[in-house]
């Protein structure tokens, strides 16, 4: 049993049936010493009498706020809650799997530069008596510092018959150099509490590997005379780290027909201009990555040919 | 991919043209090695990230564009190292900081050349011939220590009595090629900043 | 929201098998931790049996261990309680119940409840 928070306590259930469970010693926050009497939740069915409570803790029904009483008057609470293993593993019941990049994925972290600023998000489908608190660390043994503001609710997406809930965090890294080569991932860690259910969730990563900048700004078409051709234009977006020629990006431009059948004529460069052929009816989509570190492309830009 | 190039300075092109080989070559070795190794711990989750560079050279420090030099957190470890002509950008233009930042560069260089070449000659010993160095990786770092024509005391290739393990070797490779190919993305903003500069 | 009907009930003889099935609509079924509860006239809800979301882990009332199974079929939407060896104290109103807890015993622990479907055991 460890402590959480002030009067939270989880207590690890290492869950098989018939298992013995784990036994737990409560004491009650008083100096009274005598006529101190233990309930659970609203149950007015006492429990047992003393400065303390043994309990033994095999299911949820045992888990819950034990109070102590003294003559009607309310000493102290002890929530406990239960952070259940099954076959060796933690249970992952509160969020979905994500199975990007990878099965097992819970929290998915992206990172628009390379400031030390990054996002957290995780999925659901519990929609109430649900809390998480979210705390960062770059590298584990000698940890330093990452604030992490406090995760809230960002989308809900209903899917068949289920309602999906997205949470999501920012963090930003207490003294981050843009342009140091990191040896230390960056560690979240995600507690959830469902009811009296406690569950972890890790996520280990180098921001350059989460890098996903966002789309180029600004894009132009400049129609060329007498030619089907067109010059492209676009900016780097305000997001990206600076300056540019130090982190610099490459682009990919894309002339895309009306139907999504249609043969996709594709450009890589490195300029913030491109000449492509337009097509009628075609759009252009412009969209950056890193040029150097290949993490993620940015969702793509788009204008009309017409 | 190619990458296309703008037009550079004539004397900062050489560096910036094999900076970019650079990158290009060592990605293609981690790539070979995470695929031949499969069953090796070597992917960037699993390995231990070491740099054989630390404490020795200042690159990311000596090399700090301008514009992030008032940022704090990136000063904490600056300091500086001796001076030495470099031949990457016309004399009128190699400030201190500038000549600090290429000599650090070719230190770095040259560091891995000799572990390269040292853990190749064990490699060649693996009875499995599992896996060697991408020749073109070690030419590739020979012509931008060239192109950065730094003048230094030759390392001598350090040489091993004992029976290698094998095993042990290929983890080191696995380890050293992530922190080249980091340390080579460095060295590419570097080129590309001072190109552009 | 999750709806849960209970079907199967009857009337049988003491030692004799009945098997209720419990099927969901509504919400995602494999989302819950799903149980069966029952309760005989002027007695408070009693836990029989729970079983967990992939079906993979089951926990029961010691009062039915050995004689009841609970199992599941996430394809069907459906839980199911088979019943031998059935006893005149097994008689009550068979309840459904969803919820996110397992395991638990607790009626509280489950967020939904199907209306129930009578047993009664004649000796």
């Known amino acids: 049993i460890w402590e959480l928070k002030k009067d939270v306590y989880v207590v690890e259930l290492d869950w098989y049936p018939d298992a013995p469970g784990e036994m737990v010693v409560l004491t009650c926050d008083t100096p009274e010493e005598d006529g101190i009497t233990w309930t659970l939740d609203q149950s007015s069915e006492v429990l047992g009498s003393g400065k303390t409570l043994t309990i033994q803790v095999k299911e949820f029904g045992d888990a819950g706020q034990y109070t102590c009483h003294k003559g009607g008057e309310v000493l102290s609470h002890s929530l406990l809650l239960l952070h259940k293993k099954e076959d060796g593993i933690w249970s992952t019941d509160i969020l979905k799997d994500q199975k990007e990049p990878k099965n097992k994925t819970f929290l998915r972290c992206e990172a628009k530069n390379y400031s030390g600023r990054f996002t957290c998000w995780w999925l659901t489908t519990i929609s109430t008596d649900l809390t998480f608190s979210v705390k960062s660390s770059r590298g584990s043994s000698d940890p330093q510092g990452v604030t992490c503001g406090a995760a809230t609710l960002s989308a809900e997406r209903v899917r068949g018959d289920n309602k999906e809930y997205e949470y999501s965090v920012e963090c930003q890294e207490d003294s981050a150099c843009p342009a140091a080569e990191e040896s230390l991932p960056i560690e979240v860690m995600v507690d959830a509490v469902h009811k009296l259910k406690y569950e972890n969730y890790t996520s280990s990563f180098f921001i350059r590997d989460i890098i996903k900048p966002d789309p180029p700004k600004n894009l132009q078409l400049k129609p060329l005379k007498n030619s089907r051709q067109v010059e492209v234009s676009w900016e780097y977006p305000d997001t990206w780290s600076t300056p540019h020629s130090y982190f610099s990006l490459t682009f990919c431009v894309q002339v895309q027909g009306k139907s999504k059948r249609e043969k996709k004529d594709r450009v890589f460069t490195d300029k913030t201009s491109a000449t492509v052929i337009c097509r009628k009816n075609a759009s252009i989509s412009v969209r950056a990555q890193d040029r150097y570190y290949s993490s993620s492309w940015s969702e793509w830009a788009s204008v009309p040919c017409s | 991919r190619n990458l296309p190039v703008a037009t550079p300075d004539p004397g900062m092109f050489p560096c910036l043209h094999h900076s970019q080989n650079l990158l290009r070559a060592v990605s293609n070795m981690l790539q070979k090695a995470r695929q031949t190794l499969e069953f090796y711990p070597c992917t960037s989750e699993e390995i231990d990230h070491e740099d054989i560079t630390k404490d020795k050279t200042s690159t990311v420090e000596a090399c700090l564009p301008l514009e992030l030099t008032k940022n704090e957190s990136c000063l904490n470890s600056r300091e500086t190292s001796f001076i030495t002509n470099g031949s990457c950008l016309a004399s009128r233009k190699t400030s201190f900081m500038m000549a600090l930042c290429l000599s650090s560069i070719y230190e770095d260089l040259k560091m891995y050349q000799v572990e390269f070449k040292t853990m190749n000659a064990k490699l060649l010993m693996d009875p499995k011939r599992q896996i060697f160095l991408d020749q073109n990786m070690l030419a590739v770092i020979d012509e931008l220590m060239q192109a950065l024509n730094f003048n230094s005391e030759t390392v001598p290739q350090k040489s091993s009595l004992e029976e290698p393990d094998f095993y042990k070797t290929k983890i080191k490779l696995c380890i050293l090629l992530h922190a080249f190919r980091i340390r080579a993305v460095t060295i590419d903003r570097v080129m590309s900043y001072l190109n552009a500069s | 929201e999750v709806q849960l009907v209970e079907s199967g009930g009857g009337v049988v003889q003491a030692g004799e098998s009945l098997r209720l099935s419990c099927a969901a609509s509504?919400?995602?079924?494999?989302?819950?931790?799903m149980g069966w509860f029952r309760q005989a006239p002027g007695t408070e809800r009693e836990f029989v049996a729970s079983?967990?979301?992939?079906?993979?882990?089951?926990f029961y009332a010691d009062s039915v261990k050995g004689r009841f199974t609970i199992s599941r079929d996430n394809t069907k939407n459906t839980v199911y309680l088979q019943m031998s060896s059935l006893k005149p104290e097994d008689t009550a109103v068979y309840l459904c119940?969803?919820?996110?807890?397992?395991?638990?015993?607790?009626?509280?622990?489950?967020?939904?409840w199907g209306q129930g479907t009578q047993v009664t055991v004649s000796s």
């Open positions: 119940a969803a919820g996110w807890l397992f395991p638990s015993s607790r009626s509280r622990d489950y967020d939904y």
């Open positions: 509504g919400r995602s079924f494999s989302d819950y931790e």
């Open positions: 079983i967990n979301r992939r079906g993979s882990s089951t």
